[in-house]
């Protein structure tokens, strides 16, 4: 594959990454799959600067990010280390709340209306953000 040098149409470039902001809602797993099919991943927030950028674009709306603990520990979908990385949880979060009555806990992270993070039921239909790095090789064959 060739190295992607510019963002696809309708994607926003920022700091050598491309971002796509949904305007509809999907369950976390469906959002995750949508991004993968776009050769991208749910957004991985690695700095306060990136947090502010994403927050600016999504507004005060619950929005999925690429962080979950469905298999035990919290993991970023691209393998970025959670323990040493940037975090922006709301106070008392994540709390893995079982009291919602939907069966199970809260295993997927989202931006809340003030931008800080919360863990919630993964099947809730929230908006989502896809991210892909400009410097990574795309799956498309190079133009001859």
């Amino acid at each position: 594959g060739s190295e992607r040098t510019c963002c696809p149409v309708n994607w926003v470039e920022h700091e050598r990454s491309c971002y796509w902001f949904s305007r509809s809602g999907k369950a976390w797993a469906d959002a995750d799959n949508y991004c993968r099919l776009e050769d991208a991943h749910l957004v991985v927030v690695t700095s306060w600067e990136e947090q502010k950028f994403v927050q600016h674009h999504i507004g005060p709306v619950n929005t999925w990010m690429g962080l979950h603990d469905q298999n035990g520990p919290w993991k970023w979908v691209d393998g970025t280390d959670y323990e040493t990385g940037f975090k922006n949880w709301r106070p008392e979060q994540p709390d893995d709340w079982y009291g919602h009555g939907l069966g199970g806990g809260e295993d997927c992270a989202h931006f809340t209306d003030d931008g800080r993070w919360n863990d919630d039921v993964c099947q809730r239909p929230y908006r989502w953000v896809c991210e892909t790095e400009l410097d990574k090789a795309s799956q498309e064959p190079p133009l001859l």
């Epitope: 603990d69 469905q70 298999n71 035990g72 520990p73 079982y98 199970g104 997927c108 039921v121």
Partner: antibody
Framework: QIQLVQSGGGLVQPGGSLRLSCAGS????????MDWVRQAPGKGLEWVGR??????????EYAASVKGRFTISRDDSRNSLFLQMNSLKTEDTAVYYC???????????WGQGALVTVSS | QSVLTQPPSVSGAPGQRVTISCTGS?????????VHWYQQLPGAAPKLLIY???NRPSGVPDRFSGSKSGTSASLAISGLQSEDEADYYC???????????FGGGTKLTVL
């Protein structure tokens, strides 16, 4: 006390089908992932697959060796877990265990096991 | 060939201490996933022995202890007793396989 009681094992011919059941009691069944693990005669433990809870849309994962042939489902209203096994092969012969998942990643309670023998 | 590597067998005299190793890779143990240990007595279903690398469920004697470092983990059994004779399995989640992986199992013989 917490119990997982299994049923449905038996002898089946290659290419045949079988359904295993696992009934949970003594805890809130709907709040836990459930897995199936198998053990061929004289061999080690092999993970078969997982079904998550409703909050995670009952999503499933399967080992490569059974993907496309086995289906895991659950009925929270009946506190029951199921393993539907199709296109069975001789190498599927094993004792099958259901197991409850604690904190999303370890087995804290196991069923008693159900022997599945695939032979002509 | 198991994804997690354990010695096939270990042995020790009553009262002795033995350790069982479990070596993984960057997609399981090294990816930050905890290692759990299960004991399987002859003819019985497996039983949780150690969870989260080093935690003992209630009812498990403190003779059993676990640890993890990097891509490896180990189970130590001190003050060996005849009833400890069993198969021991380590397990962890694996990102590459998107599932649980087990070690091949270690048969403990109390001499």
């Amino acid at each position: 006390q917490i119990q997982l009681v299994q049923s449905g094992g038996g002898l089946v011919q290659p290419g045949g089908s079988l359904r295993l059941s696992c009934a949970g009691s003594g805890y809130t069944f709907s709040d836990h992932y459930m897995d199936w693990v198998r053990q061929a005669p004289g061999k080690g433990l092999e993970w078969v697959g997982r079904i998550r809870y409703k909050a995670n849309s009952y999503s499933t994962e399967y080992a490569a060796s059974v993907k496309g042939r086995f289906t895991i489902s659950r009925d929270d209203s009946r506190n029951s877990l199921f393993l539907q096994m199709n296109s069975l092969k001789t190498e599927d012969t094993a004792v099958y265990y259901c197991a409850r998942i604690r904190d999303r990643y370890y087995f804290d309670y196991w069923g008693q096991g159900a022997l599945v023998t695939v032979s002509s | 060939q198991s994804v997690l590597t354990q010695p096939p067998s270990v042995s020790g005299a009553p009262g002795q201490r033995v350790t069982i190793s479990c070596t993984g890779s960057s997609s399981n143990v090294g990816a930050g996933y905890d290692v759990h240990w299960y004991q399987q007595l002859p003819g019985a279903a497996p039983k949780l022995l150690i969870y989260g690398n080093s935690n003992r469920p209630s009812g498990v004697p403190d003779r059993f202890s676990g640890s993890k470092s990097g891509t490896s983990a180990s189970l130590a059994i001190s003050g060996l007793q005849s009833e400890d004779e069993a198969d021991y399995y380590c397990a962890a989640w694996d990102d590459s396989l998107n599932g649980v992986v087990f070690g091949g199992g270690t048969k403990l013989t109390v001499l």
